[in-house]
Interface confidence: medium
């Protein structure tokens, strides 16, 4: 039993880091493998993560961590019984993938403006809380070409757009994701999408 693709890990910079890797053949990850991880710090204890299967030869492990700080560094040991298959280290602050925003809501009752709001996925005491910016994706269910991205570079988790920038009388979906420039993070996963029917009063045209 050997590691084919070494573990790569990302942290949500709050409480969970996720590591994925591939073995050289079909593996029952949860019964055959253990990923041990330990904060490189005096007197810190080692923790064990039981991996799950992620495809035939793929494994994934969700490492539970205390509040992360930028200096944290973890050693990782992947064991198959008494055999060490791989070892490495992981600095969560250098591999951040933010949590996905939640509670995306489209408010359609504000005159002819669409107001999209969502929740910041971090509590106020987390460093990322005040450092997230967002991308909002809006697309038409009827027309695949009607697909747009709005970059929200301010901290407020909301976006206002004129309803008239979208077609009237058809259904749209929206979703939102986040990233933090300060840690050069990857994008979060997209939030669950929300659907609404876009309708607005066409302006009266004078001839």
């Amino acid at each position: 039993m050997k590691v084919l693709q070494e573990p790569t890990c990302v942290s949500d910079y709050m409480s969970i880091s996720t590591c994925e890797w591939k073995m050289n053949g079909p593996t029952n990850c949860s019964t055959e493998l253990r990923l041990l991880y330990q904060l490189v710090f005096l007197l810190s204890e080692a923790h064990t993560c039981i991996p799950e299967n992620n495809g035939g030869a793929g494994c994934v492990c969700h490492l539970l961590m205390d509040d992360v700080v930028s200096a944290d560094n973890y050693t990782l040991d992947l064991w198959a019984g008494q055999q060490l298959l791989w070892k490495g280290s992981f600095k969560p602050s250098e591999h951040v993938k933010p949590r996905a925003p939640g509670n995306l809501t489209v408010h359609t009752n504000v005159s002819d403006t669409l107001l999209l709001t969502w929740s910041n996925p971090y509590p106020p005491d987390n460093y990322l809380y005040n450092h997230l910016t967002y991308a909002v994706n809006i697309w038409s269910e009827n027309d695949p070409a009607d697909f747009r991205i709005y970059n929200v570079t301010y901290l407020e988790p909301s976006l206002r757009i004129a309803a008239s920038t979208l077609k009237s009388g058809i259904s749209y979906r929206a979703r939102v994701r986040a990233w933090a420039q300060c840690y050069n993070t990857t994008w979060s996963e997209w939030s669950p999408s929300t659907k609404w029917h876009n309708s607005y009063r066409e302006p009266f045209e004078q001839h």
């Epitope: 050997k2 590691v3 084919l4 070494e6 050289n24 490189v40 050693t75 055999q83 060490l84 298959l85 791989w86 070892k87 490495g88 280290s89």
Partner: antibody, heavy 122, light 107 residues
């Protein structure tokens, strides 16, 4: 019995290239990471490079980075070290060394070859 | 890179003496350390692995201890065949690094 036999050493001029080989026998070659370690005349041991079981480089010493390339052929039970842009300070006895793990190991390197001598001189 | 500082660089001792060689790592390496013996004209031979485990076939007068950054190799009672050069090796992270070596000579 595990055996590691190095070859390919010799006298070469600065700036030229040389390719070292290591023939392994007595164990399942593709189950283990392998390394090259060198020793300059009258000096200590220096780890040069390592490679995992699946031909993935595990890194190089700063002194050889960008000049040396480690590789292996599991079908031939062979380890290689391609040495380019050789310098006089690369003069050394080069050992082929077996690891105890396939990628990284808890136990480190265990079996050594007898070495092949590389002399870089004009 | 992790630096391994080995001391002393040379040591004179007599048959039957107890000898201790030390290796210090520039950062914590857990117990990812081995000790190797090399005699002139020969390849190194591993004595100790995982900081304190005795390699099969190695006499029990050799022992290793330590974890983290401080490691020692002890020879409890020197024998004539023990006069050689000894090296520590960290295999915690790449690039692997050896100590500078300790030459053990007859007094």
């Amino acid at each position: 019995e595990i055996q590691l036999v190095e070859s390919g050493g010799g006298l070469v001029q600065p700036g030229r290239s040389l390719r070292l080989s290591c023939a392994a026998s007595g164990f399942t070659f593709d189950d283990y990471a392998m390394h090259w370690v060198r020793q300059a005349p009258g000096k200590g041991l220096e780890w040069v490079s390592g490679i995992n079981w699946n031909n993935g480089s595990l890194g190089y010493a700063d002194s050889v980075k960008g000049r040396f390339t480690i590789s292996r052929d599991n079908a031939k039970n062979s380890l290689y070290l391609q040495m380019n842009s050789l310098r006089t300070e690369d003069t050394a006895l080069y050992y082929c060394v077996k690891d105890t793990g396939s990628w990284a190991s808890y136990y480190g390197m265990d079996v050594w070859g007898h070495g092949t001598t590389v002399t870089v001189s004009s | 890179d992790i630096q391994m500082t080995q001391s002393p660089s040379s040591l004179s001792a007599s048959i039957g003496d107890r000898v201790t060689i030390t290796c210090r790592a520039s950062q914590g390496i857990r117990n990812d350390l081995g000790w190797y013996q090399q005699k002139p004209g020969k390849a190194p031979k591993r004595l100790i692995y995982a900081a304190s485990s005795l390699q099969s076939g190695v006499p029990s007068r050799f022992s290793g201890s330590g974890s983290g950054t401080e490691f020692t190799l002890t020879i409890s009672s020197l024998q004539p065949e023990d006069f050689a050069t000894y090296y520590c090796l960290q295999h915690n992270s790449y690039p692997y690094t050896f100590g500078q070596g300790t030459k053990l000579e007859i007094k």
